[in-house]
């Protein structure tokens, strides 16, 4: 069964900067990745980025840079311009659309006890939906 993993990492040097790492474990070719925060895409979440293997990447503030790390994983850098950091208690979700498996989504967040520079362990919340 395909699986999506999500890691959220606070940058050690910049406490207002976070990076979300997501990956797809499974066969098939990825046709689209959608990253959202505050919940799953289309279920109360707010879209942060869309990464298409052919068309490029489109991102929305406060996302700063979305990139493919490998052909099955992506990273999304976020920067909080406000005084307080809303990211620390936020859930980030990644949805991978792949052929022929369909769509698979998982969410993760920064653990409350995280020290800067430490990343959350892979947290595939079982929202795994085959759309």
């Amino acid at each position: 069964t395909p699986e999506v993993w999500v890691q959220v990492q606070m940058e050690a040097t910049e406490l207002s900067s976070f990076t979300v790492h997501c990956g797809f474990l499974g066969p098939g070719s990825i046709s689209l990745v959608t990253v959202s925060w505050g919940g799953p895409d289309g279920a109360g979440g707010t879209k942060l980025a869309v990464l298409h293997p052919e068309l490029g990447t489109r991102q929305w503030a406060p996302a700063r840079q979305a990139r493919w790390e490998t052909q099955s994983s992506i990273s999304l850098a976020l920067e909080d311009s406000g005084a307080s950091s809303p990211f620390a208690n936020t859930t980030f979700c990644c949805k991978f659309a792949s052929f022929p498996e369909g769509s698979w989504e998982s969410c993760g967040s920064l653990p409350p006890s995280s020290d800067p520079g430490l990343s959350a362990p892979p947290t595939p919340v079982p929202i795994l939906r085959a759309d």
Epitope: P53, L55, G56, T57, R58
Partner: antibody
Framework: QVQLQQSGAELMKPGSSVNLSCKAT????????INWVKQRPGHGLEWIGE????????NYNEKFRGKATFTADTSSNTAYMQLSSLTSEDSAVYFC?????????????WGQGTSVTVSS | DIVMTQSPSSLAMSVGQKVTMSCKSS????????????LAWYQQKPGQSPKLLVY???TRESGVPDRFIGSGSGTDFTLTISNVQAEDLADYFC?????????FGGGTKLEIK
């Protein structure tokens, strides 16, 4: 032939707002993003943001957030950009441009541009 | 944001000569999936809007004469105009179409002697 027809030149007072239009013809308006680009002499081309007509989806360059607002009317195949609280820094030519089929941000068709002059 | 830097800012050439202009990006524009570079070139003639010449660094837009040749990969790109014509008098801009926000170079002004 795909065309983007923009509204005419505007002479505006500081502090006022202006609404620019971009009418699309000969393609399915709701299928393509419309980009807005600013050009000032000596400042090159700056991407203001984009809108996908037929949806509420917009995307703004952070530099222009609060300055520009995008809307679209699918019944007339027209995209709009409102610029608010105008200053001399907003004096420029503004282009609308269609995002292409093959890449999100390669812009394959451009309007002729609208010149906005802000002067008291 | 990805910073695009063009050089030279202007150049003057005679009809029939070969013109080369450069564009550098602050980060790689190479897509690991299709090995395409997300770099476009636009031509803007005086008083007109920009016109897409080349995308994916080397793919000519339909209708663009084959004397316009885009090349390069990663962070270094070149637009070459072989056998330059009088109607090529224009500003030329490179643009990364890799990610939001798309950013443009400062332009190269081509003058014809």
């Amino acid at each position: 032939q795909v065309q983007l027809q923009q509204s005419g030149a505007e002479l505006m007072k500081p502090g006022s707002s202006v609404n620019l239009s971009c009418k699309a013809t000969d393609y399915t308006f709701t299928d393509y993003w419309i980009n807005w680009v600013k050009q000032r002499p000596g400042h090159g081309l700056e991407w203001i943001g984009e809108i996908l007509p037929g949806s509420v989806t917009t995307n703004y360059n952070e530099k222009f957030r609060g300055k520009a607002t995008f809307t679209a009317d699918t019944s007339s195949n027209t995209a709009y950009m409102q610029l608010s609280s105008l200053t001399s820094e907003d004096s420029a030519v503004y282009f609308c441009a269609r995002g292409s089929d093959y890449s999100y941000y390669a812009m394959d068709y451009w309007g002729q541009g609208t010149s906005v002059t802000v002067s008291s | 944001d990805i910073v695009m830097t063009q050089s030279p800012s202007s150049l003057a050439m005679s009809v029939g000569q070969k013109v080369t202009m450069s564009c550098k990006s602050s980060q790689s524009l190479l897509n690991i999936f299709n090995q395409k570079n997300f770099l476009a070139w636009y031509q803007q003639k005086p008083g007109q809007s920009p016109k897409l010449l080349v995308y994916f660094a080397s793919t000519r837009e339909s209708g663009v004469p084959d004397r316009f040749i885009g090349s390069g990969s990663g962070t270094d790109f070149t637009l070459t105009i072989s056998n330059v014509q009088a109607e090529d008098l224009a500003d030329y801009f490179c643009q990364q179409h890799y990610s939001t926000p798309p950013t443009f170079g400062g332009g190269t002004k081509l003058e014809i002697k």
